[in-house]
């Protein structure tokens, strides 16, 4: 049909800015590039009906359904959702196409369904159908990868039983320490499930899908390294596979490795050995100890011995349930305005935790670093010297942990004032919490030295804004001070700040701020 307009249906995904929530202005958010929903004419339907591709949206995501109409003349429109009519305001873009948009903020179950858009142009009437559903991520899982020996081969298979199917990668590093950070040139990634090169210094397997990323490191004892001051400890849950690699390098092949559990040699079938010559013609041997499914009696000291190296041990602890061990008592800190400072939490946990730092309802990424003593540490330095309450939250499959921190920034008070017909109030957020004085300015006291003590009401910690205490002082108006200028001053060990208020009849009040150091 020649009269039919050229229609384009697009989906715009938005990145939510907290400030935009609840506003329904045309484009309250940062937007991603539009995705074409390919509006196609629906066959065998009465009237002209276009159908857009089905739209799946994450819970709380914000989207715009948009229709671009290339038709001559003006258009009018109406949205219908669940039998309710919704306002529709078309506008025209630079190419003079009619643009009709439906913004859905913070997608919820109640906003899922069929959105019908009725458009009337000078030439014809037609309907556009959008079907919006919530993506079912409840069935999604991301499980920590585990290792299995490949049958009849000296190789490890990495398995992560996750939905959707993850990308499985080996992350290999042949250098020591800091240079084994994820994005360092010393780190090599291989997207494959089977690894044959098992001689590297650091071997991890990672699985990634929509839910994020989980990694498992191949626990290694290196007989050529100086042993840690504290015995390395490996935690596992009942039923999980145990893998420990013992590695040793020697000038020639004349040495052997053995594994013992509590002074008893491991049974055949619970270990395998590999060896290779390195570039400088030294011999590298590795001996794996493995148990396909651990039980409580697999707990104990696993010792790797060599005929040419001092032996080293690791303590393997089998637990029924995961845990997070850390002190959860809240901590308060007081720092100067430019002092460098980081919050830190030291913990021992198994399985590895997922964590967040939260301040003022905003979450920040959480990094954790393993310490030599089996503990891990998470630090948060990105507080930008904002006082308030900071929350560290950690969880794994079996346990949860929350720790509160309060940050106080030492600074002189800053005063804000407001007044009504009956009283004047001053507020300050300085720290330490300030004390207040009120002074009356008059002919007798042009420098406002006449102190007011009657009718003053001080409230420490009037409101707690995300842990930030605010102190206030209120002066009830009496006939004696009506029509006068009064000055409220907040002072602490770092200085004083004042604000002058004209106490007259109700109306706008001029405020004059004095800063006295």
């Amino acid at each position: 049909n020649q009269d039919l307009p050229v229609i384009k249906c697009v989906l715009i995904n938005h990145k939510n800015n907290d400030s935009s929530v609840g506003k329904s202005s045309s484009y309250p958010m940062v937007s991603e590039s539009p995705e074409d929903l390919g509006c196609a004419l629906r066959p065998q339907s009465s009237g002209t009906v276009y159908e857009a591709a089905a739209v799946e949206v994450d819970v709380s995501a914000s989207i715009t359904l948009q229709v671009l109409v290339d038709a001559p003349g003006n258009i009018s429109c109406l949205w219908v959702f669940k039998h309710s009519s919704l306002n529709c305001q078309p506008h025209f873009d630079l190419q003079n196409r009619g643009v009709v948009s439906m913004v859905i903020l913070k997608m919820t179950e109640t906003q899922a369904g069929e959105y019908l858009l009725f458009i009337q142009s000078e030439a014809t009437n037609y309907t556009i159908l959008f079907t919006v559903s919530i993506r079912n991520t409840l069935l999604y899982t991301l499980r920590r990868p585990y290792f299995r020996k490949m049958e009849n081969q000296d190789a490890l298979v990495c398995i992560s039983e996750s939905v959707p199917e993850p990308i499985v990668e080996w992350v290999l590093c042949d250098s020591q320490g800091e240079s084994c950070k994820e994005e360092s040139p010393a780190v090599v990634k291989k997207e494959e499930k089977v690894l044959h090169e098992l001689f590297g210094t650091d071997i991890r397997c990672c699985a990634r899908n929509e839910l994020g990323r989980e990694c498992t490191r191949l626990f290694t004892i290196d007989l050529n390294q100086t042993p840690q001051t504290t015995l390395p400890q490996l935690f596992l849950k009942v039923g999980e596979p145990l893998w420990i690699r013992c590695k040793a390098v020697h000038v020639n092949h004349g040495f052997g490795l053995t594994w013992e559990l509590e002074n008893k040699a491991l049974e055949e079938g619970n270990y395998f050995e590999m060896s290779t010559y390195s570039t400088n013609r030294t011999m590298i041997r590795i001996l794996f100890a493995f148990v396909s499914s651990v039980a409580r009696n697999d707990t104990g000291y696993y010792t790797c011995s060599s005929s040419k190296h001092p032996s080293q041990s690791a303590l393997v602890t089998i637990v029924e349930k995961g845990f997070i061990n850390a002190t959860n008592s809240s901590e308060d800190y007081e720092i100067d305005q430019y002092e460098e400072f980081c919050f830190s939490v030291r913990f021992k946990a198994y399985p590895q935790i997922r964590c967040t730092w939260t301040f003022s309802r905003k979450s920040f990424p959480c990094e954790q670093k393993g310490l030599d003593n089996g503990y891990s540490i998470s630090k948060f330095c990105n507080h930008k010297h904002q006082p308030g309450e900071y929350i560290f939250h950690a969880e794994n499959d079996d346990a949860q942990f929350t720790k509160m921190f309060t940050l106080n920034i030492r600074r002189k008070p800053q005063v804000l004032a407001e007044a009504s017909a009956s009283q004047a109030s001053c507020f300050s957020d300085g720290y330490p919490l300030p004390s207040w004085t009120w002074k009356k300015c008059s002919d007798k006291s042009p420098n406002c030295t006449e102190e007011i003590t009657e009718g003053v009401w001080n409230r420490k910690a009037n409101r707690k804004v995300f842990g930030q205490w605010v102190s206030s002082s209120t002066l009830n108006m009496s006939e004696a001070i009506k029509g006068f200028l009064v000055k409220c001053c907040a002072y602490n060990s770092l200085g004083t700040s004042c604000e002058t208020i004209l106490l007259n009849s109700p109306g706008p009040f001029p405020f004059i701020q004095d800063n006295i150091s």
């Epitope: 959707p164 199917e165 990308i167 994005e183 499930k193 089977v194 990634r208």
Partner: antibody, heavy 115, light 107 residues
Framework: EIQLQQSGPELVKPGASVKVSCKAS????????MYWVKQSHGKSLEWIGY????????SNNQKFKDKATLTVDKSSSTAFMHLNSLTSEDSAVYYC????????WGQGTTLTVSS | DTVLTQSPATLSVTPGDSVSLSCRAS??????LHWYQQKSHESPRLLIK???QSISGIPSRFSGSGSGTDFTLRINSVETEDFGMYFC?????????FGAGTKLELK
């Protein structure tokens, strides 16, 4: 030598469906995800999804969720992509690739949807 | 979705020139970015994986750098066989996405 051999070009009518195959050789089929990509004429590439041949687990681009179904036949080391309810928008070259980093690619299967 | 913006859209060069192709991600993607070359009527070919890792069989004149949001593919001393389309692809967040491509053409 590692090779991914795709089935030949297809000319189908709107509303029909088609099954594109990708036969792998020269490596262990179950050790790598099989990745499917669409390239419309003169355009960039679009990820459709991938399948783990070991367990049949998949990850799909939501855009192709109702369009493409990925399967494998381990015995013949072959991956399949079934495309349904075809429209002219589905006319494109479809590629299979080994792994999401795509170190080996099939030669592509050209699909033309036309009445 | 993570949008990959490639620039320039077209690059006209003379054999022997050295060039840099840019790929910018709309959000941080660590180093999970890969570069492909595609010649007319051919399948894409992997050049660089994970930002900088070289691929066996790919000439050493191709190198990659960057992590986070900004990535570069460098071709030292372009040869006539290098002309074609270059795509970047991220495998950090779902859906996996490709850039629109940079066309490397003969000046």
């Amino acid at each position: 030598e590692i090779q991914l051999q795709q089935s030949g070009p297809e000319l189908v009518k709107p509303g029909a469906s088609v099954k594109v195959s990708c036969k792998a050789s020269g490596y262990s089929f179950i050790d790598y995800n099989m990745y499917w990509v669409k390239q419309s004429h003169g355009k960039s590439l679009e990820w459709i999804g991938y399948i783990n041949p070991y367990n049949g687990g998949t990850s799909n681009n939501q855009k192709f969720k109702d369009k493409a179904t990925l399967t494998v036949d381990k015995s013949s080391s072959t991956a399949f992509m079934h495309l349904n309810s075809l429209t002219s928008e589905d006319s494109a070259v479809y590629y299979c690739a080994r792994g999401t980093t795509g170190d080996y690619w099939g030669q592509g299967t050209t699909l033309t949807v036309s009445s | 979705d993570t949008v990959l913006t490639q620039s320039p859209a077209t690059l006209s060069v003379t054999p022997g020139d050295s060039v840099s192709l840019s790929c910018r991600a709309s959000q941080s993607i660590s180093n999970n970015l890969h570069w492909y070359q595609q010649k007319s009527h051919e399948s894409p070919r992997l050049l660089i994986k994970y930002g900088f890792q070289s691929i066996s069989g790919i000439p050493s004149r191709f190198s990659g750098s960057g992590s986070g949001t900004d990535f570069t593919l460098r071709i030292n001393s372009v040869e006539t066989e290098d002309f074609g389309m270059y795509f970047c692809q991220q495998t950090n967040s779902w859906p996996l996405t490709f850039g629109a491509g940079t066309k490397l053409e003969l000046k």
